[in-house]
């Protein structure tokens, strides 16, 4: 199938929260077009799917209600953030992009965005 | 349910220009590509192009470039096809469709045709 | 642009008969994310055309499932259990693996 270049940064942190953003960037031929983003997770020689979302260019991203991801595109790029991270869930989060629509069908695989998440410390109970 | 109505017949003179339009309802206008798609009188189909309802991006067949000029109004769920400098041969049924991704973009619902006669 | 040629151009039936029309493409329809771009649509007389058949031989909603479709990359055939009245109108199979989309030239089912 035809390959497609897809950009995304190669280490992101984790916020407190357990929150990670990045941008996943690809090379699309025009406007017209429908696509499906999926965030993979490979540890261990695993790899799992983490979410994924099909939207047409200019329309909102949408990924199922009880998805951990959520995001916006513009233009060719996508903001995807996931949350709900333990630091169990380091990883690396690989972003492919599959053009749907129109034909013909365009694969794109990223090199994938190691995640680190570390749990928060918590708080020492202060006795007053 | 969904509904894609289109504009009634229309008659032309060769040189002259026809704009077709297509009525989506029951469904989210966004969500789906329509398609336009002619039939000669006892033809075949023929694709002229596809629009997205979103940005109004398009994609057509090299053949009715410089023919046909695809747009759309989200406000009212409407897509529009114009044919400009008509000729004989642009006489035809010229329906819209919607493309659904659950089947990978086959054209599931279609309006009932515009015909559109090009005469002198 | 990718050619369909169906046959044959007009195909009389018994009802309670079975039918068959073929397609044939210029190019493999087969991509290699394993999905096959062929459709089959009908168009009864005085109708739009109503889809059939997705992805080669996946029935869209509402289809009866007397019919059904099988294939290669290049050659296709829809097939038909036991023809109906209602199933009288012209056939054509489509392409979508690349624009432009491009439709066989049709096949004309009719009733003995």
């Known amino acids: 199938c035809k390959a497609m270049h897809v950009a995304q940064p190669a280490v992101v942190l984790a916020s407190s929260r357990g929150i990670a953003s990045f941008v996943c960037e690809y090379a699309s031929p025009g406007k017209a077009t429908e696509v499906r983003v999926t965030v993979l997770r490979q540890a261990d020689s695993q790899v799992t799917e983490v979410c994924a979302a099909t939207y047409m260019m200019g329309n909102e991203l949408t990924f199922l209600d009880d998805s951990i991801c959520t995001g916006t595109s513009s233009g060719n790029q996508v903001n995807l953030t996931i949350q709900g991270l333990r630091a169990m869930d380091t990883g690396l989060y690989i972003c492919k992009v599959e053009l749907m629509y129109p034909p013909p069908y365009y694969l794109g695989i990223g090199n994938g965005t190691q995640i680190y998440v570390i749990d928060p410390e918590p708080c020492p109970d202060s006795d007053f | 349910q969904v509904q894609l109505v289109q504009s009634g017949a229309e008659v032309k003179k060769p040189g002259a220009s026809v704009k077709v339009s297509c009525k989506a309802s029951?469904?989210?206008?966004?969500?789906?590509?329509i398609n336009w798609v002619k039939q000669a009188p006892g033809q075949g189909l023929e694709w002229i192009g596809d629009?997205?309802?979103?940005?109004?991006?398009?994609n057509s067949n090299q053949k009715f470039e410089g023919k046909a000029t695809l747009t759309v109004d989200k406000s009212i769920s409407t897509a529009y096809m114009e044919l400009r400098r008509l000729r004989s041969d642009d006489t035809a049924v010229y329906y819209c469709?919607?493309?659904?991704?659950?089947?990978?973009?086959?054209?599931?619902?279609w309006g009932q045709g515009t015909l559109v006669t090009v005469s002198s | 642009d990718i050619v369909m040629t169906q046959s044959p151009l007009s195909l009389p039936v018994t009802p309670g008969e079975p039918a068959s029309i073929s397609c044939r493409s210029s190019?493999?329809?087969?991509?290699?994310?394993?999905?096959?771009?062929l459709y089959w649509y009908l168009q009864k007389p005085g109708q739009s055309p109503q889809l059939l058949i997705y992805?080669?031989?996946n029935l869209a909603s509402g289809v009866p499932d007397r019919f059904s479709s099988s294939g290669s990359g290049t050659d296709f055939t829809l097939k038909i259990s036991r023809v109906e009245a209602e199933d009288v109108g012209v056939y054509y199979c489509?392409?979508?693996?690349?624009?432009?989309?491009?439709f066989g030239g049709g096949t004309k089912l009719e009733i003995k």
């Open positions: 190019k493999s329809l087969l991509h290699s994310n394993g999905i096959t771009y």
């Open positions: 469709a919607r493309l659904r991704r659950e089947y990978f973009y086959a054209m599931d619902y």
């Open positions: 629009i997205n309802p979103n940005n109004g991006g398009t």
């Open positions: 489509a392409q979508n693996l690349e624009l432009p989309l491009t």
């Open positions: 992805q080669m031989s």
């Open positions: 029951g469904y989210k206008f966004t969500d789906h590509f």
